[in-house]
C-alpha cells in the first residue's frame, strides 16, 4: 500500500532521577539509547494495525513508548489504555517526523497491559498496538561465579548459574594493594568465560545481569610476599568448589611447589601446576589446589611449600550453611552539630552479604570493605547530622542480620508553642533533652521573672520521630494567669530558648520567640 506512512516504534528506558508518578509526554529524565520495537503491520486485521514488539519492564522502571511517523501534513492522535482515553500531543522532530510519546513512570502492575495509539493523518487512519508487561523477576537469580578447570587445557572457566544469562568478565590486576581498586588504570577487564593468563597478582571473575553484579576472587597465596599478620581464611559451603592458587617467583627454574592439607600432600588430581618466564627472565610458577565439590573433611590448614621460598598457609573452613557474625546490640552516639562521624559495623560473613542502611524509611546504598583479618566493615557517613534511628540490615543466602543505631546531635533547644482555651504547650527537640521553666509577665514582673510552678506538666520524649525524641511542657490555665503573657523556656547544657504566649486572647495566639 503506497499510502501507508513509514512508522518507527521505539522503547526508551530511563534511569529514574525523580520519584514522581504519572503519565506525561514531556518529562526530564536521564535516558538510555532507544530500542527499536519493529512495528510490523498486523496481518488479517480490520483496518491498518501496526504491532510493536512486546515490551517487558522491571517493576518501578520508567519508560517511554515512542512512535515516529514519516507522513506528510499534520497528524492527530489518541492513546487508549484499559478503555480510558489519554491525552496525546504530537510534535515534530528535526527531520519533520511526527513524534508521539507515552511516558510510564515507575512501572506498576496496574500500568501493564495494551496501549493503543490511534493516529489520524491527512492521508489515512491507523492504529499502533503496544503490549507492556512486568518482567517476572521472581524467577531471576544472580549467583556468585565459581571456577572450573577447562578440560585438557591449563585454563580456568568462570561459571555463574544465573537467570537471565549473565555477562561474565575477568577482572585482572598486576599491582599490589590499593591500586587494584575496580576503576584503577592497573585493572584490565576481559569479557570472556575462559582465562588462560593465570599468573597475574589479583584475579577476579564477575557475573552481571539485571539483578546486579557478583564477583569471586581467586584465593591466592604469594610466597614472595610476607604473610599476612592474621591467618588468611577461606570459607566455603559443602558442595562448593575449592580453588587456591599458590604463586612464587624465583631467579631460575630450579624450584618446585607443593600443597599439603594438614601434614599430608594433596592427592594427585587435586592440583595442577603452570609456569612461565617473566619479562626479566625470572621463573613464575603457580600451583592450584582444587576440589570440585568440598566436604566437611576438606576443612584444615592448606600449606604451600617451595624449595626456594618460606611456606605459607591458609585455613579453609567448610560450613553447612552461610552465616553473618557481628554484634547486634544497639549503639547510641552523641555528637556535635559539625562533628565528623560515621556509623560502622564490623562483621564476618559467608557468602558475601547484601546490605542497606535505612533512616526515616529511606534506604541508602551500602558499601563494604574487606579487612586483612578476614572481617569486613561497612560504614555510613551520609547522616547529614540528622538525629534519629539508623538501621543496618545485611543478608546472604542463609542468614539475616539487623543492627540499630541512635544518633543524637548536641544542640541548643528550639521552642515551638501552641495554645488552646484551657492550656498552653511548648515543644522542643534540643539534645540533651531540655528542662522547662514557665514564667509570668506582669506589672510586678515586666522581665517575666515570676516563676509558675502550679499546673505545669512536663513530658520527656513525648513523641518519637524516627528515633528523635521531642520534649514537651504543658501549662494548664488558671484564673491567676488568664489574660497574661507567659513565657516557656527550654534549657540544656548548650543554651536556652524561650517562647512568649498571650493567654486567653481572642483569635489566633501571638507567639513571640525570644532566644
Amino acid at each position: 500500500n503506497q499510502d501507508l506512512p513509514v512508522i518507527k516504534c521505539v522503547l526508551i528506558n530511563h534511569k529514574n532521577n525523580d520519584s514522581s508518578v504519572g503519565k506525561s509526554s514531556s518529562y526530564p529524565m536521564v535516558s538510555e539509547s532507544p530500542e527499536d520495537l519493529g512495528c510490523a503491520l498486523r496481518p488479517q486485521s480490520s483496518g491498518t494495525v501496526y504491532e510493536a514488539a512486546a515490551v517487558e519492564v522491571d517493576v518501578s522502571a520508567s519508560i517511554t513508548l515512542q512512535v515516529l511517523v514519516d507522513a506528510p501534513g499534520n497528524i492527530s492522535c489518541l492513546w487508549v489504555f484499559k478503555h480510558s482515553s489519554l491525552n496525546c500531543q504530537p510534535h515534530f522532530d528535526l527531520q519533520n517526523r511526527g513524534v508521539v510519546s507515552m511516558v510510564i513512570l515507575k512501572m506498576t502492575e496496574t500500568q501493564a497491559g495494551e496501549y493503543l495509539l490511534f493516529i489520524q493523518s491527512e492521508a489515512t487512519n491507523y492504529t499502533i498496538l503496544f503490549t507492556v508487561s512486568i518482567r517476572n523477576t521472581l524467577l531471576y537469580t544472580l549467583r556468585r561465579p565459581y571456577f572450573r578447570k577447562m578440560e585438557n587445557q591449563d585454563a580456568l572457566v568462570c561459571i555463574s548459574e544465573s537467570v537471565p544469562e549473565p555477562i561474565v568478565e575477568w577482572v585482572l590486576c598486576d599491582s599490589q594493594g590499593e591500586s587494584c581498586k575496580e576503576e584503577s588504570p592497573a585493572v584490565v577487564k576481559k569479557e570472556e568465560k575462559v582465562l588462560h593468563e593465570l599468573f597475574g597478582t589479583d584475579i577476579r571473575c564477575c557475573a552481571r545481569n539485571e539483578l546486579g553484579r557478583e564477583c569471586t576472587r581467586l584465593f591466592t597465596i604469594d610466597l614472595n610476599q610476607t604473610p599476612q599478620t592474621t591467618l588468611p581464611q577461606l570459607f566455603l559451603k559443602v558442595g562448593e568448589p575449592l580453588w587456591i592458587r599458590c604463586k612464587a617467583v624465583h631467579v631460575n627454574h630450579g624450584f618446585g611447589l607443593t600443597w599439603e592439607l594438614e601434614n599430608k600432600a594433596l592427592e594427585e588430581g587435586n592440583y595442577f601446576e603452570m609456569s612461565t618466564y617473566s619479562t626479566n627472565r625470572t621463573m613464575i610458577r603457580i600451583l592450584f589446589a582444587f576440589v570440585s565439590s568440598v566436604a566437611r573433611n576438606d576443612t584444615g590448614y592448606y600449606t604451600c611449600s617451595s624449595s626456594k621460598h618460606p611456606s605459607q598457609s591458609a585455613l579453609v573452613t567448610i560450613v553447612e550453611k552461610g552465616f553473618i557474625n557481628a554484634t547486634n546490640s544497639s549503639e547510641d552516639y552523641e555528637i556535635d552539630q559539625y562533628e565528623e562521624f560515621c556509623f560502622s559495623v564490623r562483621f564476618k560473613a559467608y557468602p558475601q552479604i547484601r546490605c542497606t542502611w535505612t533512616f526515616s524509611r529511606k534506604s541508602f546504598p551500602c558499601e563494604q570493605k574487606g579487612l586483612d583479618n578476614g572481617y569486613s566493615i561497612s560504614k555510613f557517613c551520609n547522616h547529614k547530622h540528622q538525629p534519629g534511628e539508623y538501621i543496618f540490615h545485611a543478608e546472604n543466602d542463609d542468614a539475616q542480620f539487623t543492627k540499630m543505631f541512635t544518633l543524637n546531635i548536641r544542640r541548643k533547644p528550639q521552642v515551638l508553642a501552641e495554645a488552646s482555651a484551657s492550656q498552653a504547650s511548648c515543644f522542643s527537640d534540643g539534645y540533651p533533652l531540655p528542662s522547662w521553666t514557665w514564667k509570668k509577665c506582669s506589672d510586678k514582673s515586666p522581665n517575666c521573672t515570676e516563676e509558675i510552678t502550679e499546673g505545669v506538666w512536663n513530658r520527656k520524649a513525648n513523641r518519637k520521630v524516627f528515633g528523635q525524641w521531642v520534649s514537651s511542657s504543658t501549662l494548664n490555665m488558671s484564673e491567676a494567669i488568664k489574660g497574661f503573657l507567659v513565657k516557656c523556656c527550654a534549657y540544656n547544657s548548650l543554651g536556652t530558648s524561650c517562647e512568649t504566649i498571650l493567654l486567653n486572647s481572642p483569635g489566633p495566639f501571638p507567639f513571640i520567640q525570644d532566644n
Epitope: P227, N263, Y301, T303, S306, S307, S311, Q312, S313
Partner: nanobody, 111 residues
Framework: QVQLQESGGGLVQPGGSLTLSCTAS????????FAWYRQAPGKQRELVAF???????TDVESVKGRFTISGDNDKNTAYLQMNGLKPEDTAVYYC?????WGQGTQVTVSS
Amino acid sequence: QVQLQESGGGLVQPGGSLTLSCTASGSTFSINHFAWYRQAPGKQRELVAFISSDGRSTDVESVKGRFTISGDNDKNTAYLQMNGLKPEDTAVYYCYYRGSWGQGTQVTVSS
C-alpha cells in the same frame, strides 16, 4: 590453631651473639614450614631465614653467613642462631609457622 612462643631476645653489643627459640604447640609439628621474620621500627616485616620444603635452611642476603636457622622436631622448636650482630639487626623478631605468628621478641644491638 598453632600457638607460637618466641624467647631469647635482649640487648647485645655489636659483634655479639644471641639464639632465639620458637616453640610450637597445638599442632603436629614439621620443621619444614618454619620461618623467621623481623620488623624494625617504621619498616615492613621482612624475611630473615626459613627452612624450605626439602628441609634446607636458607638465609636472606643481609644475614648470610651470620644467622642460621635450625630446628628440633622432637621439641617442636625452631631456632635462629645470630652471630656477628650489627646495629641494623635491631628489630622485633617473629617466627611464622603454618599461618600463625608468634608475638615477637625484641633484639637490640647497641654499644
